[in-house]
Interface confidence: low
Amino acid sequence: DPVLCFTQYEESSGKCKGLLGGGVSVKDCCLNTAYAYQERNGGLCQPCRSPRWSLWSTWAPCSVTCSEGSQLRYRRCVGWNGQCSERVALGTLEWQLQACEDKQCCPEMGGWSDWGPWEPCSVTCSKGMRTRRRACDHPAPKCGGHCPGEAQESEACDTQQVCPTHGAWAAWGPWSPCSGSCHGGPHEPKETRSRTCSAPEPSQKPPGKPCPGPAYEHRKCTGLPPCPVAGGWGPWGPVSPCPVTCGLGQTIERRTCNRPVPQHGGPSCAGDATRTHICNTAVPCPVDGEWDLWGQWSTCVRRNMKSISCEEIPGQQSRWRTCKGRKFDGHRCTGQQQDIRHCYSIQHCPLKGSWSEWSTWGLCMPPCGPNPTRARQRLCTPLLPKYPPTVSMVEGQGEKNVTFWGRPLPRCEELQGQKLVVEEKRPCLHVPACKDPEEEKL
């Protein structure tokens, strides 16, 4: 049969907590031994763990409210898939019975004494009441018992005396005009009213009491505008921390216009709310290192070979750079200090060449001297050999690019009687004078 499955079993109360859902079998619910289940009709909550005795229930109330009785408590075999011990099935109850006594004795009723004498009349004039009393001590009740009926009775009495008339206040008169024009100043403005003891006046014979309380009443005036309050500076606050960890910084002190706060049109505080000071950490600031330019590439060589120049044999070359300027624990330069690449050496190799196109015209030289000229060139450019542009290195490192290195000796057919460089020169026209721009401002 499907059951309700819960995620917790509360040992102390025996209740299922955290409903997971219904319509599942006990077997599926109890795949997790921390879970618990309950029949759909609101039956007993059973934990999914192996069966064991529950905690003892609280003791039931004593069977009698006075003198000796007895009381029961129980525990239950709860769990799933088994029993608590031999011959003790799931759901079995085990009982304990003990003697109990809520109250040692049972109450017994007492009896009344005779009525006492009548007390004096409750008033000294006109009509009132008088009372008499009796005691519950013939015999006295036992163990919290009582006597039936009332312990006192009352009846009317007449003093045959005329009562005096006591004074009573007439209605309050109107409020007087206000004693000031704004509130919150040194003297709080107020209004006053008075009343007379005449409704009625106290009798002379027999003498009546005067009216109780004051004949005058004062109250604060309402609806007045507040008195203006001029602002006053509070004390300077603490100096803020130095905002820098090295070199010079600037700290600040603040004060607030709150002693008192300006109110109701009163003037604000004069002067500054802040003041600043220089703070000196006396610590030099760190300077990070910076890479210098790369040095020249070293000669292209191959280990264990005297020279690979003009050969289709890849070699290696390296260049270095230095980390400059690091001071006071600044950051070191990031990156590599050494750069390595693969190369073919064409140093001083005789190579077939071809003439380049004309270069663009160069700058006018000398820029500030007499008769400046500009030049352009055609160069005998070497035709590089068709060696493989990449080489395979150690297993797993893939292909590496190979660079030609060195100054070859290109061979071109003679051009205008030249073998390496043909140059053409022209004069520069309309040349302005060189002047210091700062002097020109004057």
Epitope: P241, V244, T274, R275
Partner: nanobody, 119 residues
Framework: EVQLVESGGGLVQAGGSLRLSCAAS????????MAWYRQAPGKQRELVAE???????VYADSVKGRFTISRDDAKNTVTLQMNSLKPEDTAVYYC?????????????WGQGTQVTVSS
């Protein structure tokens, strides 16, 4: 001029958390200190927490260990993370920036954000 805009206020149960944020715009290069102040009804405005340009912090005794102030210079924001909130933390919270000029400082304030902590 510096403009400050607060956000993140609201109603929270005692023991809960809120994160207030203050975005600064305008002439922010000369701001050195940023701070959070608060003002409860009928009381004076009081300092809650302050942070300098290099991250030095100052906290009011009543919030030490519960509130954390931080700044993100890339976004020009200052944040107040408020944990274990108490009913007495109920107030309007104001962002404050202190700008240093050559001849002294200038105070700038946001419009305030309401924080209400219910018991």
């Amino acid at each position: 001029e510096v403009q400050l805009v607060e956000s993140g206020g609201g109603l929270v149960q005692a023991g809960g958390s809120l994160r207030l944020s203050c975005a600064a715009s305008g002439r922010i290069s000369s701001i050195i200190h940023m701070a959070w102040y608060r003002q409860a009804p009928g009381k004076q405005r009081e300092l809650v927490a302050e942070i300098s340009r290099v991250g030095t912090t100052v906290y009011a005794d009543s919030v030490k260990g519960r509130f954390t102030i931080s700044r993100d210079d890339a976004k020009n924001t200052v944040t107040l993370q408020m944990n274990s909130l108490k009913p007495e933390d109920t107030a309007v919270y104001y962002c404050n920036a202190l700008q240093y000029e050559k001849h002294g400082g200038a105070d700038y304030w946001g419009q305030g954000t309401q924080v209400t902590v219910s018991s």
